[in-house]
Interface confidence: low
């Protein structure tokens, strides 16, 4: 008996071939001997089966002795043995219809679990193997679970169902709802405008939800909500904003926040959360702000940074075009009695300059002592 695998919702074509290459009488029946369809001369006739409106044949092939049964919009319950009767012979074809669905929405938050459920006909014992967009293979029986979805899991999952040495392939598009970056860091000189961007790693037609940016300033004992906003069909509207600092927010995606000026008291780290409508859980992106200030007070030239810097970052003070006068893995460096000229304060990581602030030191003229 020939075995054919079909996919729920698809169309399948079961073949039946006569030895004579001409149009002769045929009919298709199911295992209960109920007629599905056949012919009467050049006309297609249909029987009383439940497939009635979904069954068809290809009349253009009849003259070649081919009498296929086409079943559209397959259902799991269409799984059956189909019999083609032609020229006093019977051809049996076993059709097994499988369905593979994500047990929840195919739009899932980063960190959530994906469960794929296989619908199969009674008596079948299929095995399933799925390959994620990043090439990870998972195997299972009636259900497959992937916990802790990552951004790289977004895309087309290809799942192969094996039964009776035959296979059928399913493709499921999964969208992992996440920000493009889990964390970002912005380096700014004191007084500069700060732009925070929170691009999403997915696109959907309608996006509705609400969000909030909590900020933990390095100097503050507790975190503070800087801004809350709503998202309606990709339009952003601010609900509440602190008076200090006064953030501005773009009205369109990607989410974009502007801090009028970087000040030491704002240096720290923030967590932007986005709760999407009809989704449990929230999207998160961490953002960090490092602020640099170079100052000269009397005979002391100081460079300081505030905010979350890694211990391997180097802070240096150097006269332009000269070797660094002082270079430390600390958050403040200074030079006493600096020479006149343009001094540079540099924050660097393995030789790569992350932030630079210039300060001009003027010559000091000694006042002559009066006799």
């Amino acid at each position: 008996k020939k075995v054919v695998l079909g996919k729920k919702g698809d169309t399948v074509e079961l073949t039946c071939t006569a030895s004579q290459k001409k149009s002769i009488q045929f009919h298709w029946k199911n295992s209960n001997q109920i007629k599905i369809l056949g012919n009467q001369g050049s006309f297609l006739t249909k029987g009383p089966s439940k497939l009635n409106d979904r069954a068809d044949s290809r009349r253009s092939l009849w003259d070649q002795g081919n009498f296929p049964l086409i079943i559209k919009n397959l259902k799991i319950e269409d799984s059956d043995t189909y019999i083609c009767e032609v020229e006093d012979q019977k051809e049996e074809v076993q059709l097994l219809v499988f369905g593979l669905t994500a047990n929840s929405d195919t739009h899932l938050l980063q960190g959530q679990s994906l469960t794929l459920t296989l619908e199969s006909p009674p008596g079948s014992s299929p095995s399933v193997q799925c390959r994620s967009p990043r090439g990870k293979n998972i195997q299972g029986g009636k259900t497959l679970s992937v916990s802790q979805l990552e951004l790289q899991d977004s895309g087309t999952w290809t799942c192969t169902v094996l039964q009776n040495q035959k296979k059928v392939e399913f493709k499921i598009d999964i969208v992992v709802l996440a920000f493009q970056k889990a964390s970002s860091i912005v380096y700014k000189k004191e007084g500069e405008q700060v732009e925070f961007s929170f691009p999403l790693a997915f696109t959907v037609e309608k996006l509705t939800g609400s969000g909030e940016l909590w900020w933990q300033a390095e100097r503050a004992s507790s975190s503070k909500s800087w801004i809350t906003f709503d998202l309606k069909n990709k339009e952003v509207s601010v609900k509440r904003v602190t008076q200090d600092p006064k953030l501005q927010m773009g009205k369109k995606l990607p989410l974009h926040l502007t801090l009028p000026q970087a000040l030491p008291q704002y240096a720290g780290s923030g967590n932007l959360t986005l709760a999407l409508e009809a989704k449990t859980g929230k999207l998160h992106q961490e953002v960090n702000l490092v602020v640099m200030r170079a100052t000269q007070l009397q005979k002391n030239l100081t460079c300081e940074v505030w905010g979350p810097t890694s211990p391997k970052l180097m802070l240096s003070l150097k006269l332009e075009n000269k070797e660094a006068k002082v270079s430390k893995r600390e958050k403040a460096v200074w030079v006493l009695n600096p020479e006149a000229g343009m001094w540079q304060c540099l924050l660097s990581d393995s030789g790569q300059v992350l932030l630079e602030s210039n300060i001009k030191v003027l010559p000091t003229w000694s006042t002559p002592v009066q006799p």
Epitope: K239, R240, V241, Q243, Q248, G250, P260
Partner: antibody, heavy 120, light 105 residues
Framework: IQLQQSGPELVKPGASVKMSCKAS????????INWVKQRTGQGLEWIGE????????YYNENLKDKATLTADKSSNTAYMQLSSLTSEDSAVYFC??????????????WGQGTLVTVSA | SPASLAVSLGQRATISCKAS??????????MNWYQQKSGQPPKLLIY???NLESGIPARFSGSGSGTDFTLNIHPVEEEDAATYYC?????????FGGGTELEIK
């Protein structure tokens, strides 16, 4: 901080008009420019706003097919074009900017207004 | 309300504004008040229900929360003859009240 608007306009029904709002005294790209309509002897109606920094705009649903907002960063000027004018569009149009800190959600700075008269 | 109001010089003028829904959020009321004189643009008087804008005389004060707000002017002066508008800024699009015309007797 000043917002200087262009002069009065007399236009025919069906035509279009483009008015300007030149900002000075602050960093133009840091603040949103809003536009507000006031028909003679009537109240105020918010039309929309534009972010000069990014060029992104946002409109009152009732008026979004009427107005088009643009901004030119090089000249610190915001523009509003009104199309398919009818007598209903005869009004004074103000540009306005919100404040800073506490008054950041109120219109603290206003242009002097541009009078548009639609008449055959 | 009211649409117009006549108050004697030196007396108190009270103008009310009722929002169709609450304009409060997290302890703040997003209601602003403006004064507009003929041929001039509106001028911000009060922001966030009760905060006096810089440069505005202390005889102007605002109060209220939720849906009911009041602008008080006391004592009224000649130069206060104008139309006064309330405006909510909690929800886009922001909307203005119909205005109250104040006449000084």
């Amino acid at each position: 901080i000043q917002l200087q608007q262009s002069g009065p306009e007399l236009v025919k029904p069906g035509a279009s008009v483009k008015m300007s709002c030149k900002a000075s005294g602050y960093t133009f790209t840091d603040y949103v420019i809003n536009w507000v309509k006031q028909r003679t002897g009537q109240g105020l109606e918010w039309i929309g706003e534009i972010y000069p920094g990014s060029g992104s705009d946002y409109y009152n649903e009732n008026l979004k097919d009427k107005a088009t907002l643009t901004a030119d960063k090089s000249s610190n000027t915001a523009y509003m074009q009104l199309s398919s004018l009818t007598s209903e569009d005869s009004a004074v149009y103000f540009c306005a900017r919100k404040g800073e800190n506490g008054n950041s959600l109120a219109f603290a700075y206003w242009g002097q207004g541009t009078l548009v008269t639609v008449s055959a | 309300s009211p649409a117009s109001l006549a108050v004697s010089l030196g007396q108190r003028a009270t103008i009310s504004c009722k929002a169709s829904q609450s304009v409060d959020y997290d302890g703040d009321s997003y209601m602003n008040w403006y004064q507009q004189k003929s041929g001039q643009p509106p001028k911000l008087l009060i922001y966030a229900a009760s905060n006096l804008e810089s440069g505005i005389p202390a005889r102007f004060s605002g109060s209220g929360s939720g849906t009911d707000f009041t602008l008080n002017i006391h004592p009224v002066e000649e130069e206060d003859a104008a139309t006064y508008y309330c405006q909510q800024s909690i929800q886009d699009p922001c909307t203005f009240g119909g205005g109250t015309e104040l006449e000084i007797k």
